[in-house]
Interface confidence: medium
């Protein structure tokens, strides 16, 4: 370590020698203190005489009494005023001052860059009384030093409020170059330039940069600090680093990967989560995204059978969450079904085709030809139907459900029957005479009630009328 | 679907040049690179370089700088692989493939090569 | 550059038999970079696996691949006549891309 003492002319000596515990150069025999920061006051015995200083930075005191001397302005020795060492030596400096024991309370405190430094114990304060003042040598060390400790140092010493400051003592650790930017890792498009930053302070500065790409020294003059390196641009993943240079030696940033923004991989694992007669709900795993975010996938559908026209249904959603219900299929279709994704630099291939098939639809037609009939003597109603023209999509037919609504003068009741899928007719008893039944019916499969047929009505009247209702919906052919 | 259409088989003499031609079909042309790779009878693959149709850049394998020049007619979906000074040596079918890049690189779909003998 | 070393370079082997072919690349490739290609006689090569272990579209489940750093394979469960082929792995890492000598695989 170097160091640089600055001795100026004292105007009044302090001491007829040399003080115990003054600036040791070479740094070699110091106190053997913990690393932590603070100060420990000193407090002075009390006086003799009182005394009041005057106010300021150099306290003056009064003349005691006829014949007396005068005693020396306080002030603190001048002391070494610049330390330069390596990190991780020890150090250890001090501020000496002469205090008149007419003054009380003195204590001695650290500071540094405007900080106090409290709470620590590698401060000591010593005194050496004599008749008139006492000698007090405050000591600060620091072991291993850091580039944290570098800064300014003074001492403070209040006396009866005021306050007596010492000359800076400036700790310079030097060391190896210390990043205070490194470059980042980036995605990138293809071909495209950009820009990596990298800075490094000492001491000692200056400190030069150099540049490395895969192992390589990309920059053969080194840059002073900061340095910004364009890259041109690249068509694959590179790593790059930088090497800070100073006169204690080297430091290497961290290496960082430069990606290529590319195209996605395609999702993978697709799976059927809900199948009804008209949708299917999908999830998948997306694949690897290219280094730059999904923006949207792409559901396709082929309806697989051997009479479609083999089209493909294209259904466009946000890339999250990775589910999409698929919507408008044929019921009791089977279908292939893939997915792509896509990013700002295109669209992924298509993850593999799973095959998923749409459950039995409820009957999109409602039967034919409903008639109804009063058959008084048995006393109820007789109706008749034709089997709906259902298409294979909706799955076995599987019976019909009766709507019969009675309605007379304040009343009005529903009754539904089932009747199985062999029946085209059926009959109801009479509810309520002197009321109006409407009828209604509606085929059933496996996939739900299809819709009802136009309703029919017929009067039921008092005993001794007959009443005839003409079909709702006319056979194909007959209308 | 995607394709790619490669020309026909050529017989050249030593010391001559010629250009292969790749036709790209069902797909963005710019978004994937197309490479071309040599093969030579009975013998094993490798990789000439490629070119990248958004911006033309190119990518060559060392061994083939100087033989092979890729070039692009975008507006045509084509591209094409010129061998120059050619020998016996470079007598082989060569491939073209699309590059099916995303920070690692394979060859998802290829042309069914073209047969090049140099021959005098 | 990397070079990848196939083995073995020829192999017979009889239907129904569970075939596996190695790839041992001269320094690391990540499991990611690693992919294979099969080439029927007069045809051009096709995809067959990528990123190590990921079948290609419309690639039969009895192909499979497995391994990483500089070891890697792949594995037919059960060999069909259909799969004579030679089989090529490539590395898709470093420039210029590289491909193995390749796998000469015939029937008994």
């Known amino acids: 370590a170097i160091t640089e003492a600055r001795e100026e002319a004292k105007p009044y000596p302090l001491f007829p020698g040399p003080l115990p515990g003054s600036l040791q150069t070479d740094h070699t025999s110091l106190l053997s203190l913990p690393h932590t920061s603070g100060y420990q006051p000193a407090l002075m015995f009390s006086p003799t005489q009182p005394g009041r200083p005057y106010t300021g930075n150099v306290a003056i005191p009064r003349v005691t009494s006829a014949g007396s001397k005068l005693l020396p302005p306080l002030a603190f020795k001048h002391t070494v005023g610049h330390i330069i060492l390596s990190e991780h030596k020890d150090v250890k400096f001090n501020c000496s001052i002469s205090v008149p024991n007419i003054y009380q309370d003195t204590t001695i405190s650290w500071w540094k860059d405007g900080k106090e430094l409290l709470g620590a114990h590698h401060a000591i304060t010593q005194f050496y009384p004599d008749d008139e003042v006492t000698a007090i040598i405050a000591s600060f060390s620091i072991t291993s030093v850091q580039r944290s400790d570098n800064g300014s140092y003074i001492c403070k010493m209040k006396i009866n409020n005021e306050e007596i400051v010492s000359d800076p003592i400036y700790i310079e650790v030097q060391g190896l170059p210390h990043f205070t930017k490194q470059p980042e890792s980036m995605n990138v498009t293809r071909n495209t330039a950009f820009n990596l930053t990298c800075q490094a302070v000492g001491p000692p500065e200056p400190v030069n940069i150099f540049w490395v790409q895969n192992s390589s020294r990309v920059n053969e003059q080194p840059e002073k600090s900061p340095s910004v390196l364009t890259v041109p641009g690249l068509t694959e993943m590179a790593v790059f680093s930088c090497e800070a240079h100073n006169d204690k030696g080297l430091t290497v940033s961290k290496g960082v990967q430069i990606n290529i923004k590319a195209i996605p991989s395609p999702p993978t694992e697709v799976s059927i989560h809900n199948s009804t007669a008209h949708s299917i709900l999908i999830s998948w795993v997306p694949g690897f995204d290219g280094y730059s975010p999904f923006r949207n996938c792409s559901v396709q559908v082929k309806e697989v059978d051997p009479l479609s026209n083999g089209s493909v249904m294209i259904f466009n959603t946000s890339a999250s969450p990775h589910m999409y219900q698929i919507k408008q299929l044929q019921a009791l279709a089977n279908y292939s079904i893939g997915v792509s994704c896509m990013n700002e630099i295109g669209w992924s291939a298509v993850s593999p085709w799973i095959l998923a098939s749409t459950t039995e639809g409820a009957p999109s037609v409602a039967p034919l030809n409903v008639t109804v009939f009063l058959n008084e003597s048995r006393d109820n109603v007789d109706i008749r139907w034709m089997k709906p023209l259902t298409k294979r999509q909706a799955g076995e037919l599987v019976g019909y459900r009766i709507s019969h609504v009675w309605q007379s003068a304040g009343i009005s009741k529903e009754l539904l029957e089932e009747v199985g899928q062999n029946n085209s007719r059926a009959q109801i008893s009479v509810q309520v005479h002197n009321a109006t039944c409407t009828v209604r019916i509606a085929a059933v499969t496996k996939g739900g009630v299809g819709p009802f047929s136009d309703p029919v009505k017929i009067f039921i009247p008092a005993h001794g009328w007959v009443d005839h209702a003409p079909s709702s919906t006319p056979a194909p052919g007959n209308a | 679907q995607v394709q790619l259409q490669q020309s026909g088989p050529e017989l050249v003499k030593p010391g001559a040049s010629v250009k292969l031609s790749c036709k790209a079909s069902?797909?963005?042309?710019?978004?994937?690179?197309i490479n071309w790779v040599k093969q030579r009878p009975g013998q094993g693959l490798e990789w000439i370089g490629w070119?990248?149709?958004?911006?033309?850049?190119?990518k060559y394998n060392e061994k083939f700088k100087g033989k092979a020049t890729l070039t692009l007619d975008t507006s045509s979906n084509t591209a094409y692989m010129g061998l120059h000074s050619l020998t016996s040596e470079d007598s082989a079918v060569y491939f073209c493939?699309?590059?099916?890049?995303?920070?690692?690189?394979?060859?998802?779909?290829w042309g069914q090569g073209t047969t090049l003998t140099v021959s005098s | 550059e990397i070079v990848l070393t196939q083995s073995p370079t020829t192999m017979a082997a009889s239907p129904g038999e569970k075939i596996t072919i190695t790839c041992s690349a001269s320094?690391?490739?990540?499991?990611?970079?690693l992919h294979w290609y099969q080439q029927k006689p007069g045809f051009s090569p096709k995809l067959l696996i990528y990123?190590?272990?990921n079948l290609a579209s419309g690639v039969p489940a009895r192909f499979s691949g497995s391994g990483s750093g500089t070891s890697y394979s792949l594995t037919i469960g059960t060999m069909e006549a259909e799969d004579v082929a030679t089989y090529y792995c490539?590395?898709?890492?470093?420039?210029?891309?590289?491909f193995g000598a390749g796998t000469k695989l015939e029937l008994k």
């Open positions: 493939a699309r590059g099916y890049y995303d920070n690692l690189y394979y060859f998802d779909y």
């Open positions: 069902g797909y963005s042309f710019t978004t994937y690179d």
């Open positions: 070119i990248y149709p958004r911006d033309g850049s190119t």
């Open positions: 320094s690391s490739v990540s499991s990611n970079y």
């Open positions: 990123r190590t272990s």
């Open positions: 490539q590395q898709g890492r470093i420039v210029p891309l590289t």
